[in-house]
Amino acid sequence: APPDPLSQLPAPQHPKIRLYNAEQVLSWEPVALSNSTRPVVYQVQFKYTDSKWFTADIMSIGVNCTQITATECDFTAASPSAGFPMDFNVTLRLRAELGALHSAWVTMPWFQHYRNVTVGPPENIEVTPGEGSLIIRFSSPFDIADTSTAFFCYYVHYWEKGGIQQVKGPFRSNSISLDNLKPSRVYCLQVQAQLLWNKSNIFRVGHLSNISCYETMADASTELQQ
């Protein structure tokens, strides 16, 4: 087929999709034109499974990523629930436009959020020392609308300061009790989430939380003797 005479712009380079926790952000390198005073604008389109292509605008995906001068499209900026359903097989494409001219489409490899996401550490970690125990509470890295489809389980990596690391888990609960610890000893720990997607038997191992250390409480009987 003869080349499209209007398809004379260079295409955006190195597009990448960031899937971190609930975030879905497409970014790319700008198209630089030395001979134009007008800004290059970009259009993003999406499709899923067998659908046709749709322009990424407020009505279709809740964010305007058409005729934009920015070099990123954050599908999740509007609200926690904004963005593509996490089990959808989504393909994105992108082109540059300048007046009637446009570049060729650059099509990204398809993604599924649950399949490709980078899972961060659990958040808001709170630890309550007990007698020879530590009670750990935290929130999940991100919200899952339908927990029958996908869910988090958690692991705690812990060790007595200077000792050997142990792992406890998996737990479904956002509250974990480490029992049978020595009283009046300092223990360090990290919490880790793992995302399990039932439909495809896929699991994504999350990042470890920062190391934090706590001293268990003294044994009540020991305190009485003192």
Partner: nanobody
Framework: QVQLQESGGGLVQAGGSLRLSCTAS?????MGWFRQAPGKQRELVAR???????DYADSVKGRFTISRNTAENTAYLQMNSLKPEDTGVYYC????????????????WGQGTLVTVSS
């Protein structure tokens, strides 16, 4: 300001038909209908996606049909073989595609139109 305007509710005898209409102020990716029966939770009845896909609640499959005029941003719910248990307030809903797709949590809601099916 997003607006959803419903019409077509009313009183009908069991076995009869009604057609609900909903006009939106924009071409939203998903449009659909929920209903709330007295003393019950609001439930999805049917929805239509811009690619032509439709979903129905099990209780209305084969009796209700959702359709859409994309050019006019209007969705219709054709309700046939109505039963007394179909009685309730029917709400039009619309919004973009989002993570809240299943179960659907729409961005925008209409005021509702009452459908009463008498036996």
């Amino acid at each position: 300001q997003v607006q959803l305007q419903e019409s077509g509710g009313g009183l009908v005898q069991a076995g009869g038909s009604l057609r609900l209409s909903c006009t939106a102020s924009g071409a939203y990716f998903i449009m659909g209908w929920f209903r709330q029966a007295p003393g019950k939770q609001r439930e999805l009845v049917a929805r239509t996606i811009r690619d032509g896909t439709t979903d129905y609640a099990d209780s209305v499959k084969g009796r209700f049909t959702i359709s859409r005029n994309t050019a006019e941003n209007t969705a219709y719910l054709q309700m046939n073989s109505l039963k007394p248990e179909d009685t309730g307030v029917y709400y039009c809903a619309a919004g973009p595609l989002s993570k809240s797709f299943a179960p659907w949590d729409p961005a925008y809601w209409g005021q509702g139109t009452l459908v009463t099916v008498s036996s």
